[in-house]
Structure formats: C-alpha cells, structure tokens
Interface confidence: low
C-alpha cells in the first residue's frame, strides 16, 4: 500500500486520509456524491490556494485559488489538455469527453462546427416539436394529477431533442423513450467501482483493457449507430446533424491531431469510435439539461416572486412575437437567462472538474511543484457556494448575473461548463433546449410546491453527476386555472 505522506513531504496542507479510501470514503461507499465530498474538502482549508488530497491511494491536488485555476484551465492549458481518465480507449472510451488531450484535439476540431449558430438554428425546429409534444403530454397528465416528478419527466423531453437533433430519430411514444432512457441511464446511475479502481492504481483499467461502461450500454449504442448508418446508406444525408458529420468522418477514415504531423497522429474512425461519440452526445445532451431544468423548476416553485417576474417576461416576449418562441426570442429573455445561470451556480452538474499534468508544473504563486501525471481537481460547487464570491450563496437570486455583477467577479468564479479550450462543447445546445422548454412550461403553467416537495433536497450519492435524491416533486397548475 502506498503511504499517505506524499503531500506532507511537499509541505502541502490537506485533510488526514484514511487507509484504503484516502479522502474519498463517503463517495467510495456511495454515502455521498463525489461533488459533495469535493465541496466539503474545499471548505476545510479556506486560506489555502491548493489542498493535497488522496483519491483512494492516489495523491491529487484540489485547487481553490481562482488565479491558479485560470492558469490551469486557460493560460497553461497545453500542460493540462488531458482529463486524466485512464481506462480502455476501446469500446466507448475514445469519446470526446474522456479522450486524452491529443485525441480530443483531433476529434474536437471536427465536432465544434456542429454547434455554430447556424446549425443550432436549424436544430431549433426539432427542439420546438419536442417541446410542444412535451407540453401536450404534461397538459393531458395534468387533468388526472397536477403533481409531477419533474426530473424523470424532463428526461423524456431532452431524450427526444437529442435523439432528433443528433441522430434524426423520432421516439414516437413515451414508452419508447422510457425504454431507451432506462438503458442509457444505467451508465449514470449504476454504481461502477471501476473509477475507484483507477484512482487506486492509475492506468490499471487501461492495462487490463477494462472499460467503465456496462455492456448493455455499449450494445445500445452499437445498434443505434448501425441502424442510422444503414438508414443513410453509410453517407451523409444532407440533414447536417451530428450523425451526418460522423458519416463524413467515416468516409474520411481518420481525423488528425497536430502532435507529430499529418497521418502519424491520425485517429482511425472506426464504427467503435463513432459509437463512442454517439454515446457522449446522448449522455451529455439529455441528462445535464434535464437535471438543470428540474432544479430550475424546483427553485421557481420555492421562489414565487422570481417565477412571477419570469412569467411576465415570457408573456411580454411572446406577445411581441405573435405567441411564437424563436431562436432569437430565447436569447432576448434576459431574466430567464439569468435564472438559468443562477440554477447552474447552485447546481453545477459535472463535479469535480479534472485535469492531468502532462509534465512537471510549478503552481503559480506557491512553492508547490506537481509531478507529471498528477491529477488536478477543481470543485465548482465549492467555489459557487463560497461566500467570498457569492453573498448568501444558498439563496436563489438571478440578479447575481446582472452584467455589472458578473463584471465584478473573477472570471473563474463560475464554472458550470468548465473553462478554456476544453470546456463543454455543447453548452449552447444545452442552454437552448432548456430555455425553450422552460419558456413553454411557464407560458402554460404556474409551478407550485406540492405536499411532497422536499425543501431540503439532497444530492443523489449513486450518480456520477449531480442530481436530486428521490427526484423533484412539484405541482404544475394550468395558468388558465390561476386567477
């Protein structure tokens, strides 16, 4: 067993580790979500720029100081372009999120164009159709029962929009959606201990060719991709969606990074690599947005004054646009956008942020030198709830995102999408699909707490992402019934 004196020897302060688990006992035993544990660690040493912690038996550096974060994520990005997730890159492992730095460059160059304004405008009508179907479903259900568990309900909406926008699939029935959701959701909700194994023995999963993804999930994406490739005769269809881009890459046969020169650092675009990208788009596109919307609705139920302001804004903008929600009107709704940003401050979904040093690196403003391959962690949740940056952080307050307020804050005090070159490639897509749906909901319903609304909502410990334990229960009251 490695000894836990790594950080002591380097004069880096940190919490006492426990045998085997290091500082992650609660998350390893699934008592607490990893993001919550990281927030607690962040809070233990308020005066430190960096904290030496142990993920299981591996020493890692938790960075608290915002200037240091800026160096890691932006200024010295070249040193930290790798997320440091070491498992087999076969199967679903070569996806855009988990790929090593060089492979990410090769893939990222190709996928960034999917999310240009022009492409998002084209996708908007598909999102719109999904949102209308969703509202029809909620309206029909409302006649029987006004209480909803909104997290799972919203997953059916985001599942349809990502399926339509990325893959050109239409899930006609809620039943189809639920079936697909059950399979895909396994990846997020099934506790896999592969991650802990990697923390104890970095590189072991890769050496043993082990993946962190259940076989049922791999098979789902394999058949999904096979079907779409067959439907489109293996060629781009002119829809300009994610799958068309993938088929273009398939015809090319490879993508190239610039590390060693032309074809030497090319990534062969096999059907396996295609499945990996399909997987990450699906997961990133549906779960993160559904959870964010659910939390936003929860906060609107608990803050009726804020909800009233939003409803007034939605009504005013819709009135000025003949009742239509367009790509531009969504961007126009200033207060809605601020409420969305505040939701992500309180409930940053991807926790913690992780990078790996590709060489020895001196932490700016300190005497600490981290060795090559050291994992560096950042806790958005810790920062977002730090009263140094946000007054009364547990209070939902969209006004924090007034332009002047944002201008006063350090650029690294808000990290829901990461930061720098390797930030969230789909953040504009996520915002668009979320705000469209919230607009539609608020134009038709008022949200109120139900008798089962949990006012002390906990984070689900079993999920890899931040999410509400036990779901979120609220009442949706059709506005025509509200005087």
């Amino acid at each position: 067993m490695r000894t836990f004196n790594y950080w002591k020897k380097r004069n880096v302060r940190g919490p006492e580790p426990v045998v085997f688990f290091g500082n992650l006992k609660d998350s390893a035993l699934r008592k607490k979500n990893m993001g919550v544990v990281m927030e607690e660690l962040y809070n233990m040493f308020p005066e430190e720029k960096v904290i030496g912690i142990y993920r299981m038996t591996s020493p890692c550096l938790l960075v608290r100081d915002l200037d240091v974060i800026k160096h890691i994520m932006i200024k010295d990005f070249e040193v930290f372009s790798d997320r440091g997730v070491e498992f087999s890159k076969e199967g679903l492992g070569s996806n855009l999120f988990h790929a090593d730095g060089e492979t990410w460059r090769a893939l990222g160059n190709r996928f960034t164009p999917i999310f240009t304004s022009g492409k998002l405008k084209n996708m908007f009508y598909l999102m719109h159709e999904g949102a209308d179907n969703f509202i029809d479903h909620v309206s029909a259900e409302c006649e029987k029962n006004q209480e909803f568990e909104v997290h799972s309900l919203l997953q059916t909406y985001t599942m349809s929009t990502i399926a339509a926008c990325a893959f050109g699939i239409s899930y006609d029935s809620i039943g189809d959606k639920v079936k697909a959701l059950d399979i895909v959701d396994k990846i997020i909700s099934e506790p896999s201990y592969a991650i802990e194994l990697d923390m104890m023995y970095p590189g072991l999963l890769s050496k043993l060719n082990l993946s962190i993804f259940p076989t049922v999930v791999k098979n789902f994406f394999k058949s999904l991709v096979d079907n779409i490739v067959a439907q489109r005769n293996g060629k781009p269809s002119g829809r300009n969606d994610f799958m068309d881009l993938i088929l273009e890459l398939r015809q090319l046969g490879e993508v190239t990074s610039n590390k060693y020169g032309s074809s030497a650092s090319s990534l062969e675009i096999t059907d396996e690599v295609i499945c990996a990208q399909a997987f990450v788009f699906y997961i990133a596109g549906y779960e993160t947005s559904a959870t964010t919307m659910a939390y936003m609705i929860y906060q609107l139920a608990l803050n009726p004054d804020i909800q009233n302001k939003l409803i007034a804004e939605v009504d005013e903008v819709l009135k000025a646009n003949d009742g239509k929600v367009t790509y531009d009107t969504v961007k126009e709704m200033k207060y809605l956008n601020k409420a969305f940003d505040e939701t992500l401050r309180m409930y940053s979904i991807v926790e913690p942020l992780q990078r790996k040093a590709t060489r020895d690196y001196k932490i700016p403003g300190t005497d600490v030198v981290i060795e090559k391959d050291t994992i560096v962690l950042i806790s958005p949740r810790g920062i977002h709830y730090d009263p140094k940056y946000y007054d009364n952080p547990k209070q939902f307050n969209p006004d924090r995102f007034d332009a002047e307020e944002v201008g006063k804050r350090h650029p690294c005090a808000y990290l829901p999408f990461g930061l720098g070159q390797r930030n969230c490639i789909g953040m504009r897509f996520g915002r668009l699909q979320s705000l469209l749906c919230i607009t539609k909901i608020l134009s038709k319903f008022r949200i109120e707490p139900s008798k089962n609304t949990d006012r002390n909502l906990q984070v689900e410990p079993h999920r890899g992402l931040i999410g509400p334990k036990g779901g979120i229960r609220v009442n949706a009251i059709p506005r025509k019934l509200v005087s």
Epitope: K89, E90, G93, S94, D100, A106, N209, S257, S265, A276
Partner: nanobody, 119 residues
C-alpha cells in the same frame, strides 16, 4: 499489455546502412499503429516514421524522408526501420512504440536501441 523489443542498433560509419527490428508480443491485437522515435542527447524525442498494421499506411517526418524506410511483417508481429546514407546527425537512441485504437498517443514503448554514426 503490449511488449516491444528493439534490436539492430550499433556503431556504423557515415554513409552506411542499418536495419532496426521491433518485435511485438502480448496483446498485439490492441495495437493499431507502430512508430519509430529517436532521441539524440539533449534533444526531445521525435517521431521519425509510423505504420498502421491494418492497411500499411505510412508516415515519415520531413527530416528522414527518402533515407528511412518503415515496413512490417504481420505474420511475425515485427516492424522494421531501414536507414540508408547514415549521417552523424542520426546518432540517437531509437525507440519502437505502439499505439492502440481510439487514441493518437503512443502508449507502449520499447527500451530503445543505440545507433551511433561515426564520421
């Protein structure tokens, strides 16, 4: 795990030739491409040539084009690097490396073989 063993290095006169071999063993099915790197004293390791097992697609760095030839023998799981018209500037440790599918980074390395070119 893929194990790589280089051989064929040594001391050669300028203008001479050399053939380096790299034998791969272990889970070679996981290897997508093989590359030859070299590292001269005080310099960074550089890729000189790369070949894909599946289709034999080849890459050479500009500095060695025309003088270096990479080839493979799939049946023997061996990759060769033939070096002609050797120059003192070719003196370096030559490493063989393997790259898996799904990544552009070389993740398995041999121990290296020394090539010294005397003038």
């Amino acid at each position: 795990q893929v194990q790589l063993q280089e051989s064929g290095g040594g001391l050669v006169q300028a203008g001479g030739s050399l053939r380096l071999s790299c034998a791969a063993s272990g889970r070679t099915s996981r290897s997508y491409a093989m590359g030859w790197f070299r590292q001269a004293p005080g310099k960074e390791r550089e890729l000189v040539a790369d070949i894909a097992w599946s289709d034999g697609r080849i890459y050479y760095s500009d500095s060695v084009k025309g003088r270096f030839t990479i080839s493979r023998d799939n049946a023997k799981n061996t990759v060769y690097l033939e070096i002609d018209s050797l120059k003192p500037g070719d003196t370096a440790v030559y490493y063989c490396a393997s790259r898996a599918r799904g990544t552009v980074l070389y993740n398995y390395w041999g121990q290296g073989t020394q090539v010294t070119v005397s003038s």
